[in-house]
């Protein structure tokens, strides 16, 4: 069983009184509809809450919304609906919050049917004041901020126009018509696809990919026969229709679309899809769907150019219907990802990789758990994690797995222990070492969140009944205290804490229901008095990440280096604080063959770390050879894994082979590109 409140747990002294003094209730004086909450800026304490309520009238629905603002992390709220002239705000566009600490907010309003365009409310002072602006178009999407300059906005209109503003939405200019999809790239570049004939849907596979680097003054067509495109890390991907048939292939650019290379990935047919699961500046995880409605595909990992791909995981669960995948980046430890596979017997199993997709294994069985009914052998089984797929299947899973970069090693997730994911009610499990080992943390499903960079974990039981109890732990989930935050239980709807897990405040949202009325209510609890002192040097201990065998000279080496972290001791009850920075010390490892992937035209025989030349090129390897760029076909068979920092040790030097004799051109060749100016 999970540890609880017993004599073995170190109790936090006088916590009830400390928390009672720091619990703030706010009752919202509107009827229950929907509520959305956004944090404005980082460490500002500013929260915007939008409540919307639809009143069904005879012919139409009348919408009413209210806007509230807090500047103390949710302890107090002020009704600021008058700042937006009591206008109804369209919740499907959410609240568009500017990047970083720009303090910018855009709200999209509902306007009456016959109007020429939409309406937005803009704030650039953390929602203290709003300016109403009428748009010359009806927006189809939320306003998108340029990551580099929060004054630059783009939006698509309902008539497929691409609109840009250079002065934070004050003035708008339509820079292109017939646009299907638009995205900001780096350096204020905009990428977008256009159709020529009928519509986005009709022209799918015949779209053009365009780029503008000067907000619409000039354009360059950087791709034709485009099905779709995506950005990931420093890579620009385009899914391009093949000349001869209805298949399509991925092409990659690392220079904003000036030059393209075909990716050494299988082509896909009409019913299949590609999906970028994760990408950074080093590499990309790409899912390639299997033919037929199988619900699974294959994960491939790229080299540093995004061109050569290694098969990483077979039978990767990714449903075509709901588009659900459990693929999760464990942000609390470098190189760790968790996902699900669909096994031959159609059961779903969880897999984990600690080395960025190099090897996948099952999750180790938690020490304090028994194998469930799905296990053939009651002594041997694994932990299986519930993520997006389980949530989409309406299993009793209120939350996806949680990890935070500044709460090193901590992963919290719902799961079951057996041979596969179980439909039984799950429990909550925690890992403090990035997924190597797990412990049952809480019995039954819960909502959970991490505060103060891991110094506090907060949880609330998932229940259909009203609740009034919150649980918290100051030792990474080993021991739990319960606090009754209100005498009158509420119907719980969500936990809210400032993104980044640095805050010590948690807001509990819900509603009260009486005979005639129903009202939104929030309780904000500040844990600052529980962690009454700042952490000192003595509160931290040294931890080596990815350690599996101390007797191995290279213990802890992942992608060519090991990292030691200062971690808060479980017994220390103190504040990491808002300015906490993870202290880590890397040390470079010696290279082994495992630090290299096999380049194009080479493969690793099973249980061998050497790369061997493929006797003949078949399937998509042959296509890559035929259509690949010449310089990518000269190789010694090895290529360092992206992000690998190893030095010395094994250096697989051998004769360079040239495969370019067989090769011609490529679908996205420069001669098929052109430039235009407005």
């Amino acid at each position: 069983s999970a540890p609880g409140e017993d004599e073995e747990c170190g109790r936090v002294r006088d916590f009830v009184a400390k928390l009672a003094n720091n619990t703030h209730q706010h009752v919202f004086d509107d009827a229950r509809g929907s509520v959305s909450l956004s944090w404005v800026g980082d460490s500002t304490g500013v929260i915007l809450v939008l409540t919307t309520f639809h009143v069904p009238l005879v012919i139409m629905t009348f919408g009413q919304s209210k806007l509230y603002r807090s500047e103390d992390y949710g302890k107090n709220f002020k009704d600021i609906t008058d700042l937006i002239n009591n206008t109804f705000i369209r919740t499907e566009f959410g609240m568009a919050i500017g990047p970083e600490n720009s303090g910018k907010v855009v709200l999209t309003a509902e306007v009456s049917g016959g109007s020429r365009g939409g309406r937005i409310f803009r704030s650039s002072d953390f929602a203290k004041n709003f300016v109403q602006t009428d748009l010359p178009f009806h927006p189809l999407t939320q306003m998108m901020y340029s990551p580099q300059n929060s004054d630059y906005l783009l939006a698509l209109s309902t008539e497929n126009g691409l609109w840009v503003s250079k002065n934070f939405g004050g003035k708008w200019e339509e820079i292109h018509k017939a646009v299907c999809l638009a995205k900001w790239g780096s350096d204020n570049t905009i990428f977008f696809t256009t159709y020529a004939n009928g519509s986005c849907k009709a022209d799918l596979g015949a779209l053009e990919l365009w780029r503008t680097s000067d907000l619409g003054k000039s354009f360059k067509t950087i791709g034709v026969k485009i099905y779709s495109f995506g950005l990931g890390g420093r890579f620009l991907f385009a899914s391009v229709m093949a000349d001869k048939d209805t298949t399509r292939r991925i092409h990659v650019s690392t220079d904003q679309g000036d030059t393209w290379s075909m990716a050494q990935l299988p082509s896909v047919g009409q019913e299949q899809f590609y999906s970028i699961l994760a990408a950074n500046d080093d590499m990309v995880f790409m899912h390639v769907d299997e033919p037929g409605d199988t619900g699974f595909g294959t994960i491939f990992t790229s080299d540093d150019r995004g061109i050569v791909y290694s098969k990483s995981l077979d039978r990767h669960l990714y449903t075509t219907t709901g588009g659900e995948t459990d693929f999760t980046n464990v942000t609390s430890l470098r190189g760790v990802y968790i996902t699900s596979v669909l096994s031959e017997d159609n059961s779903i199993q969880t897999m984990i990789t600690f080395d960025q997709g190099g090897r996948w294994t099952h999750l180790r069985k938690p020490e304090n758990s028994e194998c469930d009914a799905t296990a053939k052998n009651k002594n041997e089984c694994s932990l299986h994690i519930h993520a997006s797929y389980s949530i989409s299947q309406k299993l009793n899973v209120p939350m996806a797995p949680l990890s935070e970069p500044n709460a090193v090693g901590i992963v919290i997730a719902h799961g079951s222990v057996g041979d596969a994911i179980s439909v039984m009610v799950p429990d909550v499990y925690i890992s403090d070492d990035g997924g190597y080992s797990w412990t049952k943390m809480l019995e039954g499903p819960h909502y959970y969140t991490i505060l103060d960079s891991g110094g506090i974990i907060v949880a609330i039981e998932h229940s259909s009944r009203p609740i009034n109890v919150i649980k918290f732990s100051t030792d990474e989930g080993q021991c739990w205290q319960t606090y009754t935050f209100t005498r009158d239980p509420i119907y719980f709807t969500g936990l809210a804490s400032e993104p980044g897990a640095r805050s010590m405040n948690i807001s509990i949202w819900g509603f009260t229901e009486s005979f005639l009325t129903s009202q939104w209510v929030s309780y904000t609890i500040d844990f600052k008095d529980i962690l009454e002192r700042n952490c000192e040097e003595k509160d931290y201990t040294i931890w080596l990440a990815h350690s599996t065998d101390p007797e191995d000279y290279e213990d802890g080496c992942i992608l060519g280096y090991k990292e030691q972290f200062l971690r808060l001791r479980k017994s220390s009850v103190c504040q990491n604080g808002r300015d906490y920075v993870v202290t880590k010390q890397p040390s470079i490892c010696l290279c082994s063959l495992e630090d290299f992937l096999c380049d194009f035209g080479y493969y690793r025989p099973e249980n061998d770390s050497k790369c061997v030349e493929q006797p003949e090129l078949k399937g998509h390897d042959l296509e890559f050879c035929l259509y690949g760029r010449e310089e990518h076909l000269t190789t010694n068979g090895y290529r360092k894994i992206p992000g690998d920092k190893c030095q010395g040790g094994v250096n697989p030097v051998r004769e360079v082979k040239d495969l370019k004799k067989k090769c011609t051109s490529n679908f996205l060749s420069p001669e098929k590109q052109n430039s235009k100016s407005n």
Epitope: T541, L544, P550, E551
Partner: antibody, heavy 124, light 106 residues
């Protein structure tokens, strides 16, 4: 089999310093923390501090902070403990010990290998 | 720093006796406790780590239990070789040892 071999006995004058060495053989020295523990005649054990050879991360008991320096040389698999401003109360047997390790935590699993001890006598 | 209080400080027992030594931490240390045996003129020897895990090569008559603040070392049937001084040691704060328990012949 891992062994820790310490340097020989020392006799020191009050106010001076002593540097004791601890050489590891037969194991992966770099992957374990080395602690220094002392025992005055007829007394109990007292932890002075420890070091992790990779990166040279040292930490010290508050009592010895500023007076003790622990270092490690990965190339020779040797750890050193230097104690300065010696006084008669520092007369003791000084042990180096390897911190056992089952996970990434260096100090949590007890000291599984000990040196033979070095007697340091402080006398005028 | 975390204080460790060991009791009793001296314990008289006979061969075959069941012996129990307790150790109390001034604050919770989870399971991060080790037990050592030391004989005169010798270095300490690790018996138990993580409160209850037996170090390899240590006879199974030694066992440890407890977590949080209360811990126990038990020798199920005292052998002639077991007369020695025993120390507990916490590892969750800066390392500290208990004062020791001397097990002597009754």
């Amino acid at each position: 089999q891992v062994q820790l071999v310490q340097s020989g006995a020392e006799v020191k004058k009050p106010g001076s310093s002593v540097k004791v060495s601890c050489k590891a053989s037969g194991g992966t020295f770099r992957n374990y923390a080395i602690s220094w523990v002392r025992q005055a005649p007829g007394q109990g054990l007292e932890w002075m501090g420890g070091i992790i050879p990779i990166g040279g991360w040292a930490n010290y008991a508050q009592k010895f902070q500023g007076r003790v320096t622990i270092t490690a040389d990965e190339s020779t698999s040797t750890a050193y403990m230097e104690l300065s401003s010696l006084r008669s109360e520092d007369t003791a047997v000084y042990y180096c010990a390897r911190q056992g390790r089952k996970t990434g935590y260096y100090y949590y699993y007890g000291m599984d290998v000990w040196g033979q001890g070095t007697t340091v006598t402080v006398s005028s | 720093d975390i204080q460790m209080t060991q009791s009793p400080s001296t314990l008289s027992a006979s061969v075959g006796d069941r012996v129990t030594i307790t150790c109390r931490a001034s604050q919770s240390i989870s399971s991060w406790l080790a037990w050592y045996q030391q004989k005169p003129g010798k270095a300490p020897k690790l018996l138990i780590y993580k409160a209850s895990s037996l170090e390899s090569g240590v006879p199974s008559r030694f066992s440890g239990s407890g977590s949080g603040t209360e811990f126990t070392l038990t020798i199920s049937s005292l052998q002639p070789d077991d007369f020695a001084t025993y120390y507990c040691q916490q590892a969750d704060g800066h390392i500290t040892f208990g004062g020791g328990t001397k097990v002597e012949i009754k």
